[in-house]
Interface confidence: low
């Protein structure tokens, strides 16, 4: 982009500030909150998106309290620490010096502790199960049509390679999308399943992160697929470490 061009925007992330101040006058976009340069040719990391979301003026936010994730993400929204590549830092702390360890999608995987808490590595979430309940329809969706449409959505809208969509299960009215991506499978340039799941989650809530694109209009053979509840389960490569007290 040159300075004269007025379409300097980030198509994959509207929570950015863009200006033509990159090399050769090219458009460069920085995430709100962190000020980090983002690659607008692909999805922005969930960590930078959460940070941007928390930095937005309170009255400008249209937040849905994430009660529907209570089973899996009890802590909900927080202002995360991101590393220079935009990934979650393994240890997260709040302003009162309470700390905890998170996985690669930013979900707490240990009990909360103090500043002495050690989180040796960022543990990868390699399996995500997205559990959807759709609104009643005249009849059940055809499973293979639903499967094809959801795979197309993840490939075309979120640019997630189809090999990472492990399965689509359907028992009316419940749809389950399984995303799997081991560390060894993820090549340079591949979209992370955690980021794709987060964009999908925001789309489903009507809070699209894409710049200027219409909201998600999901149809199966022309029939609208309207989701009324979403649950997302995260499985890590190393099991989480919670005390027995929390498990009872």
């Amino acid at each position: 982009h040159t300075a004269a061009q007025d379409n300097c925007t980030c198509p994959t992330n509207k929570m950015t500030v863009c200006s033509p101040d990159g090399p050769g006058g090219r458009c460069q976009c920085r995430a709100l909150g962190s000020g980090m340069a983002v690659d607008c040719s692909t999805l922005t990391s969930k960590c930078l998106l959460l940070k941007a979301r928390m930095s937005a003026p309170k009255n400008a936010r249209t937040l849905v309290r994430p009660s529907e994730h209570a089973l899996v993400d009890n802590d909900g929204l927080y202002d995360p620490d991101c590393d220079p590549e935009g990934r979650f830092k393994a240890r997260q702390c709040n302003q009162t010096s309470v700390c905890w360890c998170v996985n690669s999608v930013g979900v707490r995987r240990t009990d909360k502790g103090d500043l002495s808490l050690r989180c040796d590595e960022l543990v990868r979430t390699h399996h995500i199960l997205i559990d959807l309940r759709h609104r009643p329809t005249a009849g059940a969706f055809n499973h293979s049509d639903l499967d094809a449409e959801l795979r197309r959505l993840f490939r075309e809208r979120y640019r997630l390679h189809p090999k990472f969509v492990a399965a689509v299960h359907y028992e009316q009215p419940t749809i389950q999308i399984e995303l799997r991506q081991n560390t060894s499978q993820k090549a340079a340039g591949d979209v992370d399943i955690g980021d794709a799941a987060y964009y999908f989650e925001r789309d489903i809530k009507g809070e699209s992160l894409f710049q200027g694109r219409g909201g998600l209009d999901l149809r199966v053979r022309g029939e609208p697929l309207q989701v009324e509840r979403t649950l997302i389960y995260y499985l890590d490569e190393i099991p989480p470490k919670f005390s027995m007290k929390r498990l009872t």
């Epitope: 982009h1 198509p11 994959t12 990159g22 050769g24 090219r26 458009c27 690659d39 607008c40 040719s41 692909t42 640019r159 390679h161 189809p162 090999k163 090549a187 340079a188 340039g189 591949d190 694109r213």
Partner: antibody
Framework: QIQLVQSGPELKKPGETVRISCKAS????????MQWVQKMPGKGLKWIGW????????KYAEDFKGRFAFSLETSASTAYLQISNLKNEDTTTYFC??????????????WGAGTAVTVSS | DIVMTQSHKFMSTSVGDRVSITCKAS??????VAWYQQKPGQSPKLLIY???YRYTGVPDRFTGSGSGTAFTFTISSVQAEDLAVYYC?????????FGAGTKLELK
């Protein structure tokens, strides 16, 4: 509907310069890479290189470094291939094609119709 | 550079036949292989990517398989409109490279 519309056929003399355009529509231009491919008469397809439409960074195959140059006019959703100091052996058809950005996505899902370039004195 | 070798330049077939085209990579390309169909005077058309994934709108008679260095493209029941040149391409690493093409023609 996603499409790539290429400029028309070109007749040039050796030593001249040609610029081929490829106008994208139906998708956000900066969310896909633009690849360029050469199709020699009676021969197969040969990759010239690609340009990252968001960063503007080009990458060329070894055989095409020097005289071949990619550029963008993002506001017009258009990519360009310029060939300078034309030689007779540059006579062929040139295709633009859309791709993703990472190696898992370097397949070409949408192609332009091709631009025939003829170099003759 | 990775060389993609399509062993048959021409393959003769009849309508209704099952036909398989092979492609061999000079080094391991995992499953990063695409297959294209090109008809005279037209641009190539993507059929298969990542070895076995059928592109949107491609009929299910077209399938792909393989990994590492050996790949196969199959048409389960050839239709008259399938007569064309088929190219394999590795999308594993740059420079991206194509096979020389296999022309499918009627017996």
């Amino acid at each position: 509907q996603i499409q790539l519309v290429q400029s028309g056929p070109e007749l040039k003399k050796p030593g001249e310069t040609v610029r081929i355009s490829c106008k994208a529509s139906g998708y956000t231009f900066t969310t896909a890479g633009m690849q360029w491919v050469q199709k020699m008469p009676g021969k197969g397809l040969k990759w010239i290189g690609w340009i990252n439409t968001h960063s503007g960074v080009p990458k060329y195959a070894e055989d095409f470094k020097g005289r071949f140059a990619f550029s963008l006019e993002t506001s017009a959703s258009t990519a360009y291939l310029q060939i300078s100091n034309l030689k007779n052996e540059d006579t062929t058809t040139y295709f633009c094609a859309r791709s993703g950005f990472g190696s898992s996505y370097w397949y070409f899902d949408v192609w332009g119709a091709g631009t025939a370039v003829t170099v003759s004195s | 550079d990775i060389v993609m070798t399509q062993s048959h330049k021409f393959m003769s077939t009849s309508v209704g036949d099952r036909v398989s085209i092979t492609c061999k990579a000079s080094q391991d390309v995992s499953t990063a292989v695409a297959w294209y169909q090109q008809k005279p005077g037209q641009s190539p058309k993507l059929l298969i990517y990542s070895a076995s994934y059928r592109y949107t709108g491609v009929p299910d008679r077209f399938t792909g398989s393989g990994s590492g260095t050996a790949f196969t493209f199959t048409i389960s029941s050839v239709q008259a409109e399938d007569l064309a040149v088929y190219y394999c391409q590795q999308h594993y690493i740059t420079p991206l490279t194509f096979g020389a093409g296999t022309k499918l023609e009627l017996k």
